[in-house]
């Protein structure tokens, strides 16, 4: 399995962001496909579970990403992307996308570095 991501993503505080992760595989995509998304915070704290897909999508039942993430992928199109809603500044960090598609061997885990930035104020727009 080979994984492709946007590597770097900038999004405005309070908005939603699509974390894009696509993949290629020698094996056909079927019921064995799994996708796991995790998050490594900027402060070096423990990695956190974000999302899981296996036949159906599954949100985390606890923690900061509860009720804030949804599946936006399409396995038949080799897309394992997710949507993260209502971005907060402490969502800054690295999101990892891990795709397993047996019997293909696991590939390198894809990474996206998300930067959540301030909403552009009207005065700043006027100044620009």
């Amino acid at each position: 399995v080979e994984i492709y991501t946007s590597r770097v993503l900038e999004a405005v505080n309070g908005t939603d962001a699509r974390l894009k992760c696509t993949f290629s595989s020698f094996a056909p995509v079927g019921d064995a496909l799994t996708v796991t998304w995790n998050f490594r915070p900027l402060d070096g704290g423990p990695e956190q579970f974000v999302f899981y897909y296996h036949i159906d999508p599954f949100q985390p039942m606890s923690g900061r990403f509860k009720d804030r993430v949804s599946w936006d992928g399409n396995p038949e199109r080799y897309d394992a992307s997710i949507l993260l809603w209502k971005l907060q500044f402490d969502d800054n960090g690295t999101y990892t996308c891990q795709v397993k598609n047996p019997p293909d061997v696991d590939g390198v885990i894809g990474e996206i570095r998300l930067s959540v930035v301030h909403t552009v104020r009207f005065s700043e727009i006027h100044f620009l």
Epitope: T34, G45, P46, F49, Y52, H54, R64, D90
Partner: antibody, heavy 116, light 106 residues
Framework: QVQLVQSGSELKKPGASVKVSCKAS????????MHWVRQAPGQGLEWIGE????????DYNEGFTGRFVLSVDKSSSTAYLQISSLKAEDTAVYYC?????????WGQGTLVTVSS | DIQLTQSPSFLSASVGDRVTITCRAS?????MYWYQQKPGKAPKPLIY???NLASGVPSRFSGSGSGTEYTLTISSLQPEDFATYYC?????????FGQGTKLEIK
């Protein structure tokens, strides 16, 4: 490194109350929800509930509503489990644990013994 | 609540053996966690979301499954693996644990 340090063992009489503390260090306290798990002597694990340290929001297992109260003190990065109207069947080890990719980090456990 | 039933409840095995523990759910769950617990100690995570190894866990541990049936496999038992193992589901609230499987030295 992440550490969860719990208060010491307690011996209480039926009907009394107990407050178990769990002091967190090595991570940003408000970034991870705190969970409490009970293990009666020689028995399995039961989830009591969870608390969001950012806003104090709680979610309890149905069997633990009423007498069990979770709280946090953000200033000291400490979580608390208070049990009121103690019964003999509350005798157990109580663990605090944070949810990361699983319940990855656990306190050492606090034995609460309820006996007359 | 979803009930999890582990089998076997007790298991005797020798160092080097391949061991499989099964966890059956009363209704379909999306994924499973596995923990190891030694006497007097807190549980330690082994597997998260069905098949992912927790940090620092040796590769002889593996997890698989879907729906109502999940398995934990230890490919070659080591002396330090003798302990009690618990499965846990969290694709529906409240999270629930299996009753445990005690793995003993034969």
């Amino acid at each position: 490194q992440v550490q969860l340090v719990q208060s010491g063992s307690e011996l209480k009489k039926p009907g009394a109350s107990v407050k178990v503390s769990c002091k967190a260090s090595g991570y940003t306290f408000t970034n991870y929800w705190m969970h409490w798990v009970r293990q009666a002597p020689g028995q399995g694990l039961e989830w009591i509930g969870e608390i969001n340290p950012t806003n104090g929001g709680t979610d309890y297992n149905e069997g633990f509503t009423g007498r069990f109260v979770l709280s946090v003190d953000k200033s000291s990065s400490t979580a608390y489990l208070q049990i009121s109207s103690l019964k003999a069947e509350d005798t157990a080890v109580y663990y605090c644990t944070i949810y990361t990719t699983a319940l990855d980090y656990w306190g050492q456990g606090t034995l609460v013994t309820v006996s007359s | 609540d979803i009930q999890l039933t582990q089998s076997p409840s007790f298991l005797s095995a020798s160092v080097g053996d391949r061991v499989t523990i099964t966890c059956r759910a009363s209704s379909s769950v999306g994924y499973m966690y596995w923990y190891q617990q030694k006497p007097g100690k807190a549980p330690k995570p082994l597997i998260y979301v069905t098949s992912n190894l927790a940090s620092g866990v040796p590769s002889r541990f593996s997890g698989s499954g879907s729906g109502t049936e999940y398995t934990l496999t230890i490919s070659s038992l080591q002396p330090e693996d003798f302990a009690t193992y618990y499965c846990q589901q969290w694709s529906s609230n409240p999270p629930t644990f299996g009753q445990g499987t005690k793995l003993e030295i034969k």
